[in-house]
Interface confidence: low
């Protein structure tokens, strides 16, 4: 084994490097010392270190770590805040388009119906919309609502044009009416199986994405302990002290000294594999009823459907609510 | 059948919707950042070696540094830590994980079972049993056509009408996206619902 | 052999507190999420609450929501419920139970082991 | 929430005898749907999960069937010890919901 080249002399080398760590050259001695108040570069001769210098190293050494940790995530973690704010951005326009379709289908079809199916259909892919960003709404509920509050309007506008002002009041009665006599057919039940199971399915997806950066965002930041900063003092500096500025550290050294400082962000390795894999399982089965902008998009023809389905039993629904509703001043029919 | 509302772009600024030759799917883009997520598959595994391989290291040198003295790069004291009295690296691995990193793993836990919870078999369609007058959605299309709901007459073909340009994702300042910053952690987010999935703490 | 011990139950008056804990053994504690289930006298199983491996995220059912608080001490391989503002229908067995993880996508709620209760009595 | 019903309430069977338990839902559950077997102080026991997969050390004469709103749990030839209370739950929706529970008794 060569014997280490002697160190520095003067020291002049070291303060000269030193200098861009620390301005100031109190710290680094003039000529080399012994170092016995050392912690981490112990010396086996004279060392060109102070206590205070090794502490300086140390903490370089931990930024140094931070700043190569924050690089080697920077692609990882531009992908998926790029994709997470692209897809929020896109879902939210796919609800603004599917409302506008909805909206287009009133007025080019039902235009008679228009003022107050606007409104509904505007509260319902409001909660659409929340529903994505993770509210706590009933998906089932937004759908019965928004048929709730369609079947009066369609029954006194549509069924019944000429029904008199004073009747107006059987509201709550075509309500209760719409879901007994299922006036709508399956039609209520069929958007509910569409609507929820690709919200629910586009909701996690965009949450498996926040929760990628969060990943991202705990390993990015994360604090290594003394001992690392130790090693890596070691690995990266003390070479320094014995005036041996040039020097690299040995490959399979550094490797021991990573997985020893990064035995804990290893952990999350399989943890990660398995989000990977269970993201990409997800996202193959995003189709048909499981995708969102298949489903919203085409509510507006399901909607139509549900309204012909309703006009072509006008005739017999007419006579059964007229008797149902026909006195609901006295007597509701709920 | 229903009047199809084709003037109704209103984003046409931001997305040009209806007109962009490649025709880029919010489906295609979720696969392909599928791929491009299954590159960093192995990211952490693969972390200590790609800090080694991005900090100075003794790779055409004959002489390296392995702690406490000068050695040749292929001795067996090159990968040896030359303070083993120092402390104890074996102790270093055993202190197990920080709790921020636990904490991140139970999140992680978390979503890879609701992830799988939500993940549909393929091949499923719509349920049959739509009305009493037989009703049906049928199986139809591919992943662009779909059919969606209605009835005989009224079923029509819908075709994915929101497509993307890659400038969208440009278009949006990264820097102010969520989750550039470290988040707070609330520290005791009780989601009273398995529903309420907005973020998982 | 997994094993879950519950012990903590007891008679209170209403509006008293309780505090419930669950033994576990047997398996990785640490690796699997925790639930209580209950069972009023004569009646069938109702679900209380539920904890997260690490105890990041709690879910409970809204009849206690806000009156219990689930927990866990991982490295005691324990489970706790503290039950405050108690009511006369909150008395029923107590059981904790295993979360399981069949196939990768079973979620927490699919109870692949229980314990033997223990008694919960809220009465004046 | 989800409500399960199960029916019969009670069913009187002998040893030997095919038995077989109703659970409906109020709304779809897909087939996140498990049976548990419950005996007089004892605690659950998992049978079947996901409708139809039996659950570890469950013997095969026990299968579940069913998707949707609809499910069924089929002893084929009932043993002494299985005569407990049996029931049906929802892990599809949250909350999780149970059954009301159907009791197995000996004829």
């Known amino acids: 084994q060569p014997p280490p080249p002697p160190p520095d002399a003067t020291c002049h080398q070291v303060r000269s490097f030193f200098q861009r760590l620390q301005p100031g050259l109190k710290w680094v001695p003039e000529t080399p010392v012994p170092g016995s108040d050392l912690q981490v570069c112990l010396p086996k001769g004279p060392t060109c270190c102070s206590r205070k210098m090794e502490e300086k190293y140390q903490l370089t050494a931990r930024l140094n770590m931070e700043q190569l940790l924050q690089s080697a995530s920077m692609e990882l973690k531009f992908l998926i805040i790029q994709n997470a704010a692209v897809f929020q951005e896109a879902f939210e326009i796919v609800v603004r388009h599917a409302k506008n379709y909805t909206n287009a289908m009133f007025k080019n079809n039902y235009p008679s119906l228009t003022p107050q199916a606007f409104e509904f259909v505007g509260e319902f892919f409001t909660d659409v919309s929340l529903y994505i960003l993770g509210s706590d709404i009933n998906v089932d509920d937004m759908v019965n609502e928004l048929f709730d509050s369609l079947f009066p309007v369609i029954y006194t506008q549509l069924m019944n044009p000429g029904l008199p002002d004073s009747a107006l009041d059987i509201n709550e009665c075509l309500r209760g009416a719409r879901r007994d006599l299922k006036v709508f057919g399956n039609f209520p039940k069929l958007i509910m199986t569409q609507v929820s199971k690709s919200l629910q399915v586009t909701r996690i997806f965009l949450q498996a994405l926040n929760l990628g950066i969060e990943v991202i965002n705990t390993t990015d930041h994360l604090k290594f302990s003394k001992d690392c900063g130790r090693m890596l003092t070691r690995m990266w500096y003390c070479s320094y002290c014995q005036g041996l500025m040039m020097v690299k550290p040995c490959g399979g050294y550094c490797n021991v000294v990573m997985q020893g400082c990064m035995a804990g962000v290893v952990e999350i390795d399989k943890y990660w594999r398995e989000y990977i894999l269970s993201l990409e399982e997800l996202v193959n089965g995003m189709y048909r009823i499981y995708d969102m902008e298949n489903v919203l998009l085409g509510l507006f023809s399901t909607i139509h459907d549900s309204i012909q389905y309703v006009q072509k039993n006008a005739g017999k629904l007419t006579t059964t609510i007229g008797k149902l509703c026909a006195h609901s001043q006295q007597r509701q029919y709920r | 059948s229903a009047y199809y509302p084709e003037d109704l772009f209103i984003d046409k600024k931001v997305l040009k919707v209806a007109h962009v030759e490649h025709e880029e799917t919010l489906s295609s883009r979720r696969r392909e950042l599928i791929q491009k997520l299954k590159s960093f598959i192995s990211f952490y595994s693969a972390l200590p070696g790609y800090i080694c391989s991005h900090s100075p290291v003794a790779e055409n040198d004959t002489l390296c540094w392995n702690g406490q003295e000068l050695v040749e790069r292929y001795s067996q004291k090159a990968a040896r830590n030359g303070m083993k009295n120092q402390f104890n690296l074996h102790e270093l691995k055993m202190k197990g994980p920080e709790p921020v990193v636990s904490q991140i793993i139970d999140k992680l836990k978390h979503i890879n079972q609701l992830l799988r919870t939500m993940s549909m078999p393929k091949g499923r369609v719509l349920d049959k049993n739509l009305d009493e007058e037989g009703f049906e959605s049928g199986d139809c299309g591919d992943d662009e056509d779909e059919c969606i709901g209605g009835s005989g007459d009224g079923m029509i073909k819908v075709k994915n009408q929101l497509r993307f340009l890659a400038e969208l994702a440009y278009d949006l300042d990264v820097d102010d996206a969520p989750g550039n910053s470290q988040q707070a952690t609330p520290k005791d987010n009780e989601i009273s619902t398995f529903h309420n999935l907005g973020n998982v703490h | 052999e997994v094993q879950l011990v519950e012990t903590g139950g007891g008679l209170v008056q209403p509006g008293g507190s309780l505090r419930l804990s669950c033994a576990a053994s047997?398996?990785?504690?640490?690796?699997?999420?925790m639930n209580w289930v209950r069972q009023a006298p004569g009646k069938g199983l109702e679900w209380v609450s539920y904890i997260t491996s690490g105890g990041s995220s709690r879910y409970y059912a809204d009849s206690v929501k806000g009156r219990f608080t689930i927990s866990r001490d991982n490295a005691k391989n324990s489970l706790y419920l503290q039950m405050n503002s108690l009511r006369d229908e909150d008395t029923a067995v107590y059981y904790c139970a295993r979360g399981t993880y069949y196939y990768g996508s079973g979620n927490y709620f699919l109870f692949d082991y229980w314990g033997q209760g223990t008694t919960v009595t809220v009465s004046s | 929430e989800i409500v399960l019903t199960q029916s019969p309430a009670t069913l009187s069977l002998s040893p030997g005898e095919r038995a077989t338990l109703s659970c409906r839902a109020s709304q779809s559950v897909s087939s996140y749907l498990a049976w548990y077997q419950q005996k007089p102080g004892q605690a659950p026991r998992l049978l079947i999960y996901d409708a139809s997969n039996r659950a570890t050390g469950i013997p095969a004469r026990f299968s579940g069937s069913g998707s949707g709103t609809d499910f069924t749990l089929t002893i084929s030839s009932l043993e002494p010890e299985d005569f407990a209370v049996y029931y049906c739950?929802?892990?599809?929706?949250?909350?999780?919901?149970f059954g009301q529970g159907t009791k197995v008794e000996i004829k």
């Open positions: 047997g398996f990785s504690f640490s690796s699997y999420a």
């Open positions: 739950q929802q892990r599809s929706n949250w909350p999780p919901t």
